[in-house]
Amino acid sequence: HNTTVFQGVAGQSLQVSCPYDSMKHWGRRKAWCRQLGEKGPCQRVVSTHNLWLLSFLRRWNGSTAITDDTLGGTLTITLRNLQPHDAGLYQCQSLHGSEADTLRKVLVEVLADPLDHRDAGDLWFPGESESFEDAHVEHSISRSLLEGEIPFPPTS
């Protein structure tokens, strides 16, 4: 799997999309996990509803939400109030039994808020030793959500 890069601005929301074959993964729950080192395990952050038929319902774990369009074949993860420590390598997964198939590898990069004049030295970017060949960059710089606003995925 190639790695897709999603960039978001610190303090704002970042939406990550993972397309998949809706028939191949029919009936399977999905998950979002964080890779612990390039060869390490992938630690589950959040998974879709326990009942696959209700996968469209958004589920939250802390500031991370997941929702699955099982007909269209798109898994959407929202990272709300993005922080420097959210940067890193993640995976979208399709679950069957205790197994997980990787749908997409995702590198999250956190950009400094241009309106925030604090030191950006702690913002994380992959160093030379962590370069990701053939990584595809998707800029997903979004505004902060208003109080009570539902973070719907883009309709395009």
Partner: antibody, heavy 123, light 107 residues
Framework: EVQLVQSGAEVKKPGESLKISCKGS????????IAWVRQMPGKGLEWMGI????????RYSNSFQGQVTISADKSISTAYLQWSSLKASDTAMYFC????????????????WGQGTLVTVSS | DIQMTQSPSSVSASVGDRVTITCRAS??????LAWYQQKPGKAPKLLIY???SLQNGVPSRFSGSGSGTDFTLTISSLQPEDFATYFC?????????FGQGTKLEIK
């Protein structure tokens, strides 16, 4: 009606090659995984591997990796199991089975099976 | 690989009897277990999936229970057509593995 129809019995000599088939009908062949299962004479069932005909994504059991090749031709709704060099120990009944994901528990079970292909390898 | 162990390996019973077959997994498999029936010269037939869900068209005298490592298949009142070999199968992880089978014979 969902059906998996397998090719007929084969008698081969050690070292020969063989390709057996499993043709699906009555459902969308490209939308379900197909597994191959071996049953040696008088023995239990052994899962060999699986293929998704839609994109030919294939998984093998470690026991069969490198020993057999699983493939599919979605244009004719057929999955295949092949050997490049048969051994006497390959003598068995081979079943193909459709794998269905049941959304209740997001796991996979074999809901339809072919009638089996008996492969006999003897010098 | 997960090992599946069935007991007994064979059982003799009469029409009308209640029969229980057990299956034990070498590690926890949640409820990811299926039961199949196979008659001589025929392909296996799915009876139970997800440990306790009855497959369409399977008579209600068949039932399954259990989770984790211990599972049972129960036939509440044996019918002549039930004499066959029964296999359990885990759907937890690859490779999928089957029990060695339980042969149900007429007493």
């Amino acid at each position: 009606e969902v059906q998996l129809v397998q090719s007929g019995a084969e008698v081969k000599k050690p070292g020969e090659s063989l390709k057996i088939s499993c043709k699906g009908s009555g459902y969308s062949f490209t939308s379900y995984w197909i597994a191959w299962v071996r049953q040696m004479p008088g023995k239990g069932l052994e899962w060999m591997g699986i293929i998704y005909p839609g994109d030919s994504d294939t998984r093998y059991s470690n026991s069969f990796q490198g020993q057999v090749t699983i493939s599919a031709d979605k244009s004719i709704s057929t999955a295949y199991l092949q050997w490049s060099s048969l051994k006497a120990s390959d003598t068995a009944m081979y079943f193909c089975a459709r794998q269905r994901t049941f959304y209740y528990d997001s796991s996979d079970y074999f809901d339809y099976w072919g009638q089996g292909t008996l492969v006999t390898v003897s010098s | 690989d997960i090992q599946m162990t069935q007991s007994p390996s064979s059982v003799s019973a009469s029409v009308g009897d209640r029969v229980t077959i057990t299956c034990r997994a070498s590690q926890g498999i949640s409820s990811w277990l299926a039961w199949y029936q196979q008659k001589p010269g025929k392909a296996p037939k799915l009876l139970i999936y997800a440990a306790s869900s009855l497959q369409n068209g399977v008579p209600s005298r068949f039932s399954g229970s259990g989770s984790g490592t211990d599972f049972t298949l129960t036939i509440s009142s044996l019918q002549p057509e039930d004499f066959a070999t029964y296999f359990c199968q885990q759907a937890d992880s690859f490779p999928r593995t089957f029990g060695q089978g339980t042969k149900l014979e007429i007493k």
